[in-house]
Structures are given as C-alpha cells and as structure tokens.
C-alpha cells in the first residue's frame, strides 16, 4: 500500500502526515500582574495562568516566565484579547478647555523573540485612542493572525499600561497559539 | 508499511490520523431575535441561521435551539462577532450635568454548557462601555479562541441586550466553531 | 495495512489524508495605498505586501492585483485587521450645536468574488460609528471567520475610506487566510 493513496496528488513527498491531536497548543488566561522591570521604551509583558481553569498548554508547547515557547517550526495561529479598564475621564481637558488635545491610548502587541536575533519582532498590534467621556470605561482589544515560527521562538504579549488590564476574569483577557 | 513512516517521530501512537474535511465545523449567521424567557441574572442567548446563505453546519456539528452541539471531544477554535447598534446618546446625562456617571455597556459572552455540570462556563467575554455622544452609534465586538471541549458540550452566544443586536446582514453578526 | 487504522471510524473513505504543511496559506501586510478607480457604491479595495517582512503566500495560494486567489476548494479561516486613523474631531457639530447628528463611520468588508457569479459576496463586515471628541483618533477593526470556498474564488478587503488606513506598520493592518 503506497502512502500517496491517502494524499492528494499535489502533496510533497517530504511533508509528513501528522495527527492533529498531537500538535503544540496553548490557551493562557489572565492573572493579576505584578509590576516588573522592563526596558524604558518597551511596553511591559503580561504574565499568564497556564494550567488552571480554561488555561492549558499541550504537546511540548510550554509557558515560562511570560513567554510561550515554540517547540517546533511551522505555521501558527496566534491570538490574544486584552480587556482594558480605566477609572478616569480620559479627555476631561477637552471638555473643560474647549480645545482638542492628544488623547491617551491603549495598545496590545504580540511580540516574537528569537534568541539568534537581537531585536524582538512585533507580530501584531492593536492600538486605540481613548478619549472617554465617562469616568468608568472598559473595552477589549482583540488580535489574531497566522505566522511562520521557528523552533525556539518565544511569544509574549505586551501592553501599554499594565495597571489598566482587567484581570478579574479568565474570559476577558487571554493569549493563545496553535500549530496549524 | 508502518504508520510512523507518515508521522513525525514525536507522534503518540494512539493519536489517529484524520482527514481534515471530515472535522466538525459550523458558521452560523444572525437572524432577527424573538425574545424568550431567560434567567434573571443571565444574559439572553441569540438564535442563529444554520443553513441559508453563508451559514452551514457539517460533519455532525449540529445546531439546535440556540446551541451548537459538540459531536466529538477535542480542541476547537470558537469565534463570534456581534454588531451592536444604538439609537440614543448613552451619556447625555454627563454632558448635561457636567459630571461623569456609570456608562451603559454592551457585552458578548460565549458560553459552554455541560449537562453533567450544574453551572454554564463562560469561555469568552467581550465587554465595552458605551458612552456615545452621537445618538446613532454602532460597533462590533469580536471574540475568538481555542478550547478543549468534550463530546456533548453545548455552545451559545449571550448578549447583554438582544434589542441592540444588528440583524440586518449575515456578515455583521455571526458565530462559528471548528475542530482543530 | 488498511487506511482505516489511521482514521477514526466516522471518516469518509473518500476524504484523503493530507499533510498540514502542504495547505494553501497567506498572511498579507499593509502597504501605502495608491488611490485607484472603484465603482461608485462599492468601497475601495486595499492592496497588500505578500512577500516582505511578515508577509507570505505558500502552497499555491497566490496574491495578485488586490486579490488572494483560492487554489483549491475547502473550508478556510479568513481574517483581517485594519487600523484606522483620523486627524479631525468627527463630531464637532454635536458639541457646538448641542444636538446629535448621524456620526461618521469606518467599515471593513472582506469580499469574495466568484467569476461565474455576477455580484461579489460580502463575507465579513466590521463597521463602527466614529464620533470622537479628540482630534487625533485611531482604532482597529478585526474580523475573522470560516467559510467554504471554491477553487478560483478571489478574496479582497474593502474599506470605507482608504485615506484613513494606517499603513505605517505591518502589524497594524493585515489580511490572511488558510485552508483548514
């Protein structure tokens, strides 16, 4: 019995078949953040829950020290949502002074770190101006896309202000990746 | 011929190979909602189109009575977008009285129901304060992530207010899931 | 050796096994747009980077003239994010006149074109009213879902106003698809 009987005619002979349940996958959920040192011009990275509740890592996809570690090369779908929450009216100056100014913003970046490469690579960015009139505002930023990653690459989620991240529920703020 | 000739060296022997076209999948699209009873402190669930237009269910993934029924255990990517629309300025009090108040909000929750488990599990939540100045406002909330589900689990989409959901077009409000 | 030793009992015999690395995939990233002709009532289509930086096409998924070309029939996950940026206060009339009016809006549409079908099909739409108080505003719209596509189908991303698209970074505005 020849292998190609199972494979469409255009399959490359060197591409191995692969059980889907065996692929590296992770879904991480929010925890309360403890402020840590980060470089001056780099947004701080979030740390995550990786095994309790809805969170899991499997098939050699490991989480360590704010990073998801990519265990094998391939195309991955990577996603994250961060829910931000603010307690102040971000644009009170405008209303009081009657003139526009530069609004504050909230930003999420999914970043790839490759040890052999000096600079991190920003894979995905969601950024939004926040010019809220009400004093209690909240909103999510969602990101997701496919990237070609190499074994040993590390993924993290950076945010513009760690103190604005809503960590109250695991379904509001999360981070995941899976090999396609 | 040995199975491992088709599989990378780290494949678990018990993980069966599987044709991708055979996996449970569904993409559901919005229909006009008819209000039904729901528990006092639980958001109402949306019902959906499952076979007309862009909507489909396949490979034993069935839709019934607001629920997507999971036909086999595994890791699923689940997503939804709900477009909300409003016809009143939600923060007029603020502008008139010159003081902030708690703004209204819009929320989407993707919920898992497991018959053997008493409480539904909230898998994903997108929630946003609405403090719009203009009286005709509209905006989407998008959610998507991967979860380990069990055969027999049921998925639904709940919203904070069914009357604010835009049901005019199938591309604005939708719900889907597929086995990875 | 029988094929079913690798396949669960419910697999259709005609569904071929398939190496994942061989599937059509693309991730396109933003470039500066050059305004081109478009039909009066149709939003203009964005054009994309398909090979530099994070962008790629592989396994017969080709990009040409604003379109992603679908090389084989199947279920695809399709996604896009467009970050919009504006330099004017969109609702100044409201604040000046003290009365609500119809706000401006930003819209993203992922559209399918089938040569044998006269009208394009809108697969996904994200639309948001923009009634920003601050004069420098920016925000993303994200879309993603699964669709059954046919060989030869073409995908494009249309936006309500090409001049508001943020083309400064490849991680802010992007478009992708992959066969499941």
């Amino acid at each position: 019995l020849k292998g190609q009987e199972f494979a469409p005619s255009h399959q490359q002979v060197y591409a191995p078949l692969r059980a889907d349940g065996d692929k590296p996958r992770a879904h991480l959920t929010v925890v309360r953040q403890t402020p840590t040192q980060h470089f001056k011009n780099q947004f701080p990275a979030l740390h995550w829950e990786h095994e309790l509740g809805l969170a899991f890592t499997k098939n050699r996809m490991n989480y360590t020290n704010k990073f998801l570690l990519i265990p094998e090369s391939g195309d991955y779908f990577i996603y994250s949502q961060v829910t931000f929450r603010g307690m102040t009216s971000e644009c009170s100056e405008i209303r009081q002074a009657g003139r526009p100014n530069k609004p504050d913003s909230i930003t999420v970046v999914i970043t790839k770190v490759t040890d052999s490469y000096p600079e991190p690579t920003q894979l995905l960015m969601g950024t939004k101006s926040v010019c809220e009139v009400g004093s209690n505002w909240f909103q999510p930023i969602y990101l997701g896309a496919m990237f070609s990653l190499q074994e040993g690459d590390k993924l993290m989620v950076n945010v513009s202000d760690i103190s604005l991240v809503d960590y109250t529920k695991e379904d509001k703020t999360f981070f995941g990746a899976f090999l396609l | 011929l040995k199975g491992q000739e088709f599989a990378p060296s780290h494949q678990q022997v018990y993980a069966p190979l599987r044709a991708d076209g055979d996996k449970p999948r569904a993409h559901l699209t919005v229909v006009r909602q008819t209000p039904t009873q729901h528990f006092k402190n639980q958001f109402p669930a949306l019902h959906w189109e499952h076979e007309l237009g862009l909507a489909f269910t396949k490979n034993r993934m069935n839709y019934t009575n607001k629920f997507l029924l999971i036909p086999e255990s595994g890791d699923y990517f689940i997503y939804s977008q709900v477009t909300f629309r409003g016809m009143t300025s939600e923060c007029s009090e603020i502008r008139q009285a010159g003081r902030p108040n708690k703004p209204d909000s819009i929320t989407v929750v993707i919920t898992k129901v497991t018959d053997s488990y008493p409480e539904p599990t909230q898998l994903l939540m997108g929630t946003k304060s609405v403090c719009e100045v203009g009286s005709n406002w509209f905006q989407p909330i998008y959610l998507g992530a991967m979860f380990s589900l069990q055969e027999g689990d049921k998925l639904m989409v709940n919203v904070s207010d069914i009357s604010l959901v835009d049901y005019t077009k199938e591309d604005k409000t939708f719900f889907g899931a597929f086995l990875l | 050796l029988k094929g079913q030793e690798f396949a669960p009992s419910h697999q259709q015999v005609y569904a071929p096994l398939r190496a994942d690395g061989d599937k059509p995939r693309a991730h396109l990233t933003v470039v500066r747009q050059t305004p081109t002709q478009h039909f009066k009532n149709q939003f203009p289509a964005l054009h994309w980077e398909h090979e530099l930086g994070l962008a790629f096409t592989k396994n017969r998924m080709n990009y040409t003239n604003k379109f992603l070309l679908i090389p084989e029939s199947g279920d695809y996950f399709i996604y896009s994010q467009v970050t919009f940026r504006g330099m004017t206060s969109e609702c100044s009339e409201i604040r000046q006149a003290g009365r609500p009016n119809k706000p401006d809006s930003i819209t993203v549409v992922i559209t399918k074109v089938t040569d044998s079908y006269p009208e394009p099909t809108q697969l996904l739409m994200g639309t948001k009213s923009v009634c920003e108080v601050g004069s420098n505003w920016f925000q993303p719209i994200y879309l993603g879902a699964m669709f059954s596509l046919q060989e030869g189908d073409k995908l494009m991303v249309n936006v309500s106003d090409i001049s508001l698209v943020d083309y400064t970074k490849e991680d802010k505005t992007f478009f992708g698809a992959f066969l499941l």
Partner: antibody, heavy 116, light 107 residues
C-alpha cells in the same frame, strides 16, 4: 405576546401639555426602545421620539423643544409629554416597541384632540 | 433628515393582481428599511423587515427587495384583505422617517 396600551385624556386645550402613558404587558420594559408615533387624521405617520429603559432618549428635532419621554421600569410604563400644543397636534398617538431596525409591536392608538 | 418617497400614492387593483410599490430614500440606508400595512382604524402592522425578510405570520405573497436607496414591496396575488395603506420606513438614522403612504384600493 407583548401588548401596549395607551392611556390619557382625549381632549387637551391649546397651549396646555398633552400627557399620555403607555403600559407594557407580556414582557419586560427593561430591554428594547419604547417609542411614540403619531398620525394626524387622514395623514401619514410621524415619529415623535423614543426612550431606552436606561432613560436615554432621542427626539424628533421638529418636536424636540416641546417633547419629554420618560420611563418607569417598576411599573412597566413609559410616558409622553408634549407641551404648548396647538390644533396641529391633533392626532392618533401610538406607543410602540422598537429594536434597532423595526417597530414591531404597536398599541391600538388613542385619539387626542386639541381644542378649546 | 432622510426623506422617504413612496410611489404611487394610490393604486387601484383587482383580486389576483400582482402589485408593486416602490420607496426611495434620499440617501443610502443599507438594509435598515421596513414595510408596514395599516387598515382603517387600526395600528400599523410590520410586514417586511430589513428590506427583504418576511415578518412571522405574514403571508408569503408579500415580498420585499432592494438595498441602499431603492426598495420594492411586491404582492404576488392580491387578496381581499390586502386592500389597505402601506408605509415604508427607515431606521438607518434618527429621526426615524416614514414614506407618505400608498393607498391600495379595489378597482
């Protein structure tokens, strides 16, 4: 099945304030938009305004200076006040439920005549 | 305000006839568009919503089409109970506006 019932005086004097109440039964008022529409005898429909259960409102600019719509969720009622009425305000007044696309449930209407 | 212009303003037809009423919006309103039927002494009744969807309980001889600015209501085979006044309405932006009505009479 949601039902709406208008109530209030059928006769109002010019320059006075027209006051109507709509009672909602068969469903909660704590969702949806609640609207007032009027129809002068032999004429077409004119939208007056609406209220969300939270209390936020939207009025027709042509009537805005004279209209107030309010809601009482505890009684499942909403109300219309139209001040400084003239003979031109004589109409059948309908209360109705709306979502963001349609006006799907209507009261049977009540005729209000403005006359001295 | 968005103006809704219906035509014709009145129409005479017989039982069994196919009837078409049109409505034009003064600006694009996507599919935020509805048709209502009103009989003498009664409140309007929703027939078609979102331009082309049939309201539950409404006979299938009624159909709607259109998007953007131009919309059509079609009654495929007039029945005696269909003689009434028909209104179009937009909810794309406020103020919500109605067409002036089309009175459908027995010929």
């Amino acid at each position: 099945q949601v039902q709406l019932q208008e109530s209030g005086p059928g006769l109002v004097k010019p320059s006075e304030t027209l006051s109507l109440t709509c009672t909602v039964s068969g469903g909660s008022i704590s969702s949806y938009y609640w609207s007032w529409i009027r129809q002068p005898p032999g004429k077409g429909l004119e939208w007056i305004g609406l209220i969300y259960y939270s209390g936020s409102t939207n009025y027709n600019p042509s009537l805005k200076s004279r209209v107030t719509i309010s809601v009482d969720t505890s009684k499942n009622q909403f109300s219309l006040k139209l001040s400084s009425v003239t003979a031109a305000d004589t109409a059948v007044y309908y209360c109705a439920r709306a979502d963001v696309v349609t006006i799907d449930y209507w009261g049977q209407g009540t005729l209000v005549t403005v006359s001295s | 305000d968005i103006q809704m212009t219906q035509s014709p303003s009145s129409l005479s037809a017989s039982v069994g006839d196919r009837v078409t009423i049109t409505c034009r919006a003064s600006q694009t309103i996507s599919s935020y568009f509805n048709w209502y039927q009103q009989k003498a002494g009664e409140a309007p009744k929703l027939l078609i919503y979102a331009a082309s969807s049939l309201q539950s309980g409404v006979p299938s001889r009624f159909s709607g089409s259109g998007s953007g600015t131009d919309f059509t209501l079609t009654i495929s085979s007039l029945q005696p109970e269909d003689f009434a006044t028909y209104y179009c309405q937009q909810s794309y932006s406020t103020p919500i506006t109605f067409g002036q009505g089309t009175r459908l009479e027995i010929k």
